[in-house]
């Protein structure tokens, strides 16, 4: 939560923003509220982004004023016009991209004064539900060494990967994780666990997106000996 106050000259007003994260390829909301004014025509909202020459968005005299808008935001922004009068200056952002991450400023002018507050906006893409594969995948017996691969796709930024057994005990040894960026800059994650089988065993992989606070889970259970394991584990 960031609360900003006004600039000298006029009275200052309180402007409040909340740091947030947006999903790539979806709508995002940059939150900003301010002390409301009784006349919509007296309210000016300007959104700016650090390192961007033009404005992100401007709303004044009750309507959008986009003559100064930077081209990277053209057709991608809107305020909630019916909520401006009650102090909502939040911005709707279309089709969030990696490049939208950064520091934004919500700058407000009303008849009561001026104020601004910064907002840190992060962007991310959720990781897909992991697919689990086993090698070898048949004639498994206790004491065999198997390789379990957990694969999750099209996330951003790089993931954190955790393995655990059926009792929730972390498995940290013999884990190799690789992350490769695709042509869009999104990451595909492959994590490999080498483990010696017990009589029965559940092995779980958790792929965490640190920005979106999103967890994707996959698990495989090996029961009964001897057994034949399907090439694609269902979970």
């Amino acid at each position: 939560l960031i609360i900003g106050f006004g600039i000298s000259g006029r009275h200052s007003i309180t402007v409040t923003t909340v740091a947030s994260a947006g999903n790539i390829g979806e709508d995002g909301i940059l939150s900003c509220t301010f002390e409301p004014d009784i006349k919509l025509s007296d309210i000016v909202i300007q959104w700016l982004k650090e390192g961007v020459l033009g404005l992100v968005h401007e709303f004044k005299e009750g309507k959008d004023e986009l003559s100064e808008q930077d081209e990277m935001f053209r057709g991608r922004t809107a305020v909630f016009a019916d909520q401006v009068i009650v102090g909502n200056a939040s911005l709707r952002l279309k089709n969030v991209q990696l490049t939208d991450a950064g520091t934004y400023k919500c700058y407000i002018i009303t008849s009561k004064g001026k104020g601004n507050a910064n907002l840190e906006y992060k962007t991310g893409a959720p990781y897909s539900k992991p697919s689990m594969t086993l090698e070898p995948n048949k004639d498994l017996r206790p004491g065999d060494t198997v390789t379990i691969t957990c694969s999750s796709y099209r996330g951003y930024p790089e993931a954190e990967v955790f393995w655990q057994d059926g009792q929730g005990v972390p498995l940290t040894g013999n884990v190799t994780t690789s992350q490769m960026a695709n042509e869009q800059g999104l990451f595909d994650v492959h994590s490999v666990l080498r483990v010696v089988l017990g009589a029965n065993g559940t092995y779980s992989c958790l792929v965490r997106n640190p920005v979106l606070q999103q967890d994707a889970h996959g698990s495989v259970t090996i029961t009964g000996q001897p057994m034949t394991f399907p090439p694609e584990a269902l979970w």
């Epitope: 390829g25 979806e26 709508d27 968005h57 309507k63 959008d64 004023e65 986009l66 003559s67 808008q69 053209r74 057709g75 991608r76 922004t77 809107a78 016009a81 709707r92 279309k94 089709n95 099209r154 869009q184």
Partner: antibody, heavy 121, light 107 residues
Framework: EVQLVQSGAEVKKPGASVKVSCKAS????????IGWVRQAPGQGLEWIGD????????NYNEKFKGRVTITRDTSTSTAYLELSSLRSEDTAVYYC??????????????WGQGTLVTVSS | DIQMTQSPSSLSASVGDRVTITCKAS??????VAWYQQKPGKAPKLLIY???TLQPGVPSRFSGSGSGRDYTLTISSLQPEDFATYYC?????????FGQGTKVEIK
Amino acid sequence: EVQLVQSGAEVKKPGASVKVSCKASGYTFTSYWIGWVRQAPGQGLEWIGDIYPGGGYTNYNEKFKGRVTITRDTSTSTAYLELSSLRSEDTAVYYCARLDGSSYRGAMDSWGQGTLVTVSS
Amino acid sequence: DIQMTQSPSSLSASVGDRVTITCKASQGFNKYVAWYQQKPGKAPKLLIYYTSTLQPGVPSRFSGSGSGRDYTLTISSLQPEDFATYYCLQYGNLLYAFGQGTKVEIK
């Protein structure tokens, strides 16, 4: 109620130009993008381009670039589509449509009735 | 430019049938896919936008889903008034693109 009323049918000769109008009412004209779409007889929908009346910004389908111009007159809340160097394959119904989402370019949620443009020698 | 490949181009179905139409984007991924219904001599009508949001006034038998490059329009129980042509629209990028259309005919 949002309404888009288009100009009447046109018959043009190959090589000529046509200008179709779309008069908007029931909302703030300068706050929403307006798009143009065409449909040749028995064919599918084809996006031509759009304009933000509040600033005159335009986007065009690469296929029509150089031949198409989208303009607006804010005093009459009217958008225009002009297509030049007409050929027989430009014979189609031309639709204007308002884009949802205000200054945000959304999907086309309200449509005009369509204008039939026939290109024939 | 992104192309939208729609399938099937036509289908025959009966009243009460469940109907599924798909659209595949040539590249990229975002949720900005809308679905339209068009009847002969009429302008298209918006049914669904942002992949799965139903336009007000549209019956709940229409639903949309999808992610990545693959998107689907489903009519859970086809009604007589649903026989029409359906189009998908990709509107996430600078340049918009329609699918080729799917004609739903009476079997």
